[in-house]
Amino acid sequence: QQAPYWTHPQRMEKKLHAVPAGNTVKFRCPAAGNPTPTIRWLKDGQAFHGENRIGGIRLRHQHWSLVMESVVPSDRGTYTCLVENAVGSIRYNYLLDVLERSPHRPILQAGLPANTTAVVGSDVELLCKVYSDAQPHIQWLKHIVINGSSFGADGFPYVQVLKTADINSSEVEVLYLRNVSAEDAGEYTCLAGNSIGLSYQSAWLTVLPEEDPTWTAAAPEARYTD
């Protein structure tokens, strides 16, 4: 028989976890002993089962872990893992601080939407991934030409709004272009906005003439290039 002991103490060296609000926190207390010990979690010295926590918690006993998603300021506190068997018990304290982030303009993932080359008649998907503290809204714009010009007298580009949507934070927004023609070629912009401001990123769609099926191998419908 053996009292509980930590099997990977080096993984437990980070005692203070300062995490931005909305992030996921994982505490681990990997242990062993004979008989195999059990693990319980306390928050500020009280038994913690997460029943009062929006989103609850995930306890993975085989991984000796506690997982909390989308942390909020009320999750701040001291989290104790209590590992025990018939021979003895050990405990370890983690401190959680939840940092309230400053709401910012939406951040668009670099490289999205991506420049894309497609063949006439194929389908194209343009992707835009938005990170935003406040709920963002998205517009897909196509830059258009009016009277032979891409810009108005004021110097601003002519655009056509193709799609408007409210999305959840960190969701991927997709613009589907079905059965593309040469007229669909051009510059497309993903615009994301929230209460702080707007952010834009653009990509070019190149549309190639239909290839001769007698010599073309089965090619993918669209090719993405950076």
């Epitope: 910012h104 668009l108 670099a110 709920q135 517009q139 615009l191 401001g197 707007l198 834009y200």
Partner: antibody
Framework: EVQLLESGGGVVQPGRSLRLSCAAS????????MHWVRQAPGKGLEWVAV????????YYADSVKGRFTISRDNSKNTLSLQMNSLRVEDTAIYYC?????????????????WGQGTMVTVSS | DIVMTQSPDSLAVSLGERATINCKSS???????????VYWYQQKPGQPPKLLIY???NRFSGVPDRFSGSGSGTDFTLTISSLQAEDVAVYYC?????????FGGGTKVEIK
């Protein structure tokens, strides 16, 4: 003409409440976030609060958090600032400012249109 | 919070001469979309601030071309190439990238 007109300012004692209003005209009010910014006499500009176009998101400066509440009535094109537990240091001109629009904008995405301001004096 | 530090506090320039106002932010205002979100305002006594420059270097409509904005990342400059009598005012920089939005302390421009 795009216009913002604040009202509701006045002299009030510390600890009391006041409600400011801002009437918007000349643009689609319900498509824009709106802000309050204040300026103490002879001092610089201080951002106070913002509300999203539909009222679902609100953020405040730490100096007013828990005391001030920003709200809007899109059917009446009005923005409000409910100020409770007023302090002497809240004395300022309060400006209503248009923020980011809900979609593509030609030019700046907000902070382009300011009202004339309304004076709030907190004094015993 | 992002701190905006303006210099100088005041500036006396002869008519027709160049006026240069500096602004420094405590963190980069270059956003992921490639734009730098610093704005410049002019405020005359008894009036609300008026937007001059947005997104670092874009002149707002109706603003004379003697006003220009430049800089990158954390260091920004508003330049009045040839000061006119009507340019006497207080000038403010502002960061418009995250809340709380913050302003510089202001620079008072006078005629020498």
């Amino acid at each position: 003409e795009v216009q913002l007109l604040e009202s509701g300012g006045g002299v009030v004692q510390p600890g009391r409440s006041l409600r400011l209003s801002c009437a918007a005209s000349g643009f689609t009010f319900s498509s824009y976030a709106m802000h309050w910014v204040r300026q103490a006499p002879g001092k610089g500009l201080e951002w106070v609060a913002v509300i999203s176009y539909d009222g679902s998101n609100k953020y405040y400066a730490d100096s007013v958090k828990g005391r001030f509440t920003i709200s809007r009535d899109n059917s009446k094109n009005t923005l409000s600032l409910q100020m409770n537990s007023l302090r002497v240091e809240d004395t300022a001109i309060y400006y209503c400012v248009r923020g980011a629009g809900r979609g593509y904008t030609y030019g700046p995405d907000g902070f382009d249109i300011w009202g004339q301001g309304t004076m709030v004096t907190v004094s015993s | 919070d992002i701190v905006m530090t303006q210099s100088p506090d005041s500036l006396a320039v002869s008519l027709g001469e160049r006026a240069t106002i500096n602004c420094k932010s405590s963190q980069s205002l270059l956003h992921s979309d490639g734009k730098t979100y610093v704005y410049w305002y002019q405020q005359k006594p008894g009036q609300p601030p008026k937007l001059l420059i947005y997104e670092l270097s874009n002149r707002f409509s109706g603003v004379p071309d003697r006003f220009s904005g430049s800089g990158s990342g954390t260091d920004f400059t508003l330049t009045i190439s040839s000061l006119q009598a009507e340019d006497v005012a207080v000038y403010y920089c502002m960061q418009y990238i995250e809340a709380p939005l913050t302003f510089g302390g202001g620079t008072k421009v006078e005629i020498k």
